[in-house]
Interface confidence: low
């Protein structure tokens, strides 16, 4: 799997999970989240050569097409596969609220 | 939806479905498929600005991060959403075989 266990231990130009820390206020302009101040969101990036963690048959077709027709603009892309939620604390007035924001953390990637 | 009904009627720089005809022999080097000779595979391409057909919460976060930090390499990507199968005819010896190849045709796109 193109997850932290593999990607963070290997120098990989191909599609892989990349570390990304997001500070809510600085990076997103969000003032409303009290805790945490930021989180490890991660992201997916890298090349998608033929058969590199292909998501679907179409992805395989597209990467093969791209290999044979390298000048073509049609090529697969490295995107998130498994995501996890993030628990946040915010306030409505003086009342603290805890909420789980779904699909906030990328855990693994794929070529799609 | 970023499908043919919308994308093929509008000039759209942002993420959208793009037409792509694939000739099995010429474009993929596949000689084994007897019929069809090729098919409209389509593909997804285009920019993923903030809130443009975002797939997940993480995609929204990433596109906002990318807007505020345009020099960053972390940005969402335009990929396939809905896919359909393709029915093909091929031969094993003189015996014709009909098979459905899943996820061969892209019908719509998303930013992920």
């Amino acid at each position: 799997a193109l997850d932290a266990a593999y990607c963070f231990r290997n120098v990989q130009d191909n599609c892989c999970l990349r570390p990304l820390y997001i500070d809510f206020k600085r990076d997103l302009g969000w003032k409303w989240i009290h805790e945490p101040k930021g989180y490890n969101a991660n992201f997916c990036a890298g090349a998608c050569p033929y058969l590199w963690s292909s998501d679907t048959q179409h992805t395989k077709v597209l990467s093969l097409y791209n290999t044979i027709n390298p000048e073509a603009s049609a090529s697969p892309c490295c995107v998130s596969q498994d995501l996890e939620p993030l628990t946040i604390l915010y306030y409505i007035g003086n009342t603290p609220k805890i909420e789980q924001l779904s699909n906030m953390i990328v855990k693994s990637c794929k070529c799609s | 939806a970023l499908d043919a009904a919308y994308c093929f009627r509008n000039v759209q720089d942002n993420c959208c479905l793009r037409p792509l005809y694939i000739d099995f022999k010429r474009d993929l080097g596949w000689k084994w498929i007897h019929e069809p000779k090729g098919y409209n595979a389509n593909f997804c391409a285009g920019a993923c600005p903030y809130l443009w057909s975002s797939d997940t919460q993480h995609t929204k976060v990433l596109s906002l991060y990318n807007t505020i930090n345009p020099e960053a390499s972390a940005s969402p990507c335009c990929v396939s959403q809905d896919l359909e199968p393709l029915t093909i005819l091929y031969y094993i010896g003189n015996t014709p075989k009909i098979e459905q190849l899943s996820n061969m045709i892209v019908k719509s796109c998303k930013c992920s």
Epitope: G29, W32 | I68
Partner: antibody, heavy 120, light 106 residues
Framework: QVTLRESGPALVKPTQTLTLTCTFS??????????VGWIRQPPGKALEWLAH???????SYSTSLKTRLTISKDTSKNQVVLTMTNMDPVDTATYYC????????????WGQGTLVTVSS | DIQMTQSPSSLSASVGDRVTITCRAS??????LNWYQQKPGKAPKLLIF???SLQSGVPSRFSGSGSGTDFTLTISSLQPEDFATYYC????????FGQGTKVEIK
């Protein structure tokens, strides 16, 4: 495709209560962080923010008008309703609803606006 | 409440001119400042958010700068479709709009 549309009476009498409905599509107020706000603009004058409601039912109101305003949402109908009591001719304006995302405060999608005239 | 003061209230300019509009907040609002363009009979359109981030689809001739109390919207080369009224908006505490700047043809 995000769209918002305001609806309500074009004419109200002084002292009456105005009820405006914002019907939207392309997003949901059940999504974490999503908000809808109301803004008005008297003829030839500047924009004035009135009220806001978020996915979690958090509401905020303009300080100068908070005693007259009530904002509510019906998530299942994709609607936000604003009521304004004790209408006065100075409240004659085009009333807009707009979508705000994640408490960022800016309005990225607007309705076309509805003109409300207060006159007897 | 935070007050937003725009200047000038109106200006005349020609196509190709560089136009600068300023907005001053009555107290520190960090970078919680947005700019909108409004044409007659139409709803406002978001141009810049977070003081300097260009909204998707907005031409790059528009730019924003500033932090704290003083902010600027710049149109590097005015185009015919840019003649409109421009509003700043602070979102640091509640919401407040400026009084608007009308950009007219000279």
């Amino acid at each position: 495709q995000v769209t918002l549309r305001e609806s309500g009476p074009a004419l109200v009498k002084p002292t009456q209560t105005l009820t405006l409905t914002c019907t939207f599509s392309g997003f949901s107020l059940s999504t974490s962080g999503m908000g809808v706000g109301w803004i008005r603009q008297p003829p030839g004058k500047a924009l004035e923010w009135l009220a806001h409601i978020y996915w979690n039912d958090d509401k905020s109101y303009s300080t100068s008008l908070k005693t007259r305003l009530t904002i509510s949402k019906d998530t299942s109908k994709n609607q936000v309703v604003l009521t304004m009591t004790n209408m006065d001719p100075v409240d004659t304006a085009t009333y807009y609803c707009a979508r705000d995302f994640y408490y960022s405060g800016y309005f990225d999608s607007w309705g076309q606006g509805t003109l409300v005239t207060v006159s007897s | 409440d935070i007050q937003m003061t725009q200047s000038p209230s109106s200006l005349s300019a020609s196509v190709g001119d560089r136009v600068t509009i300023t907005c001053r907040a009555s107290q520190d609002i960090s970078n919680y400042l947005n700019w909108y363009q409004q044409k007659p009979g139409k709803a406002p359109k978001l141009l810049i958010f977070g003081a300097s981030s260009l909204q998707s689809g907005v031409p790059s001739r528009f730019s924003g700068s500033g932090s704290g109390t003083d902010f600027t919207l710049t149109i590097s080369s005015l185009q015919p479709e840019d003649f409109a009224t421009y509003y700043c908006q602070q979102t640091n505490t509640m919401n407040t709009f400026g009084q608007g700047t009308k950009v007219e043809i000279k």
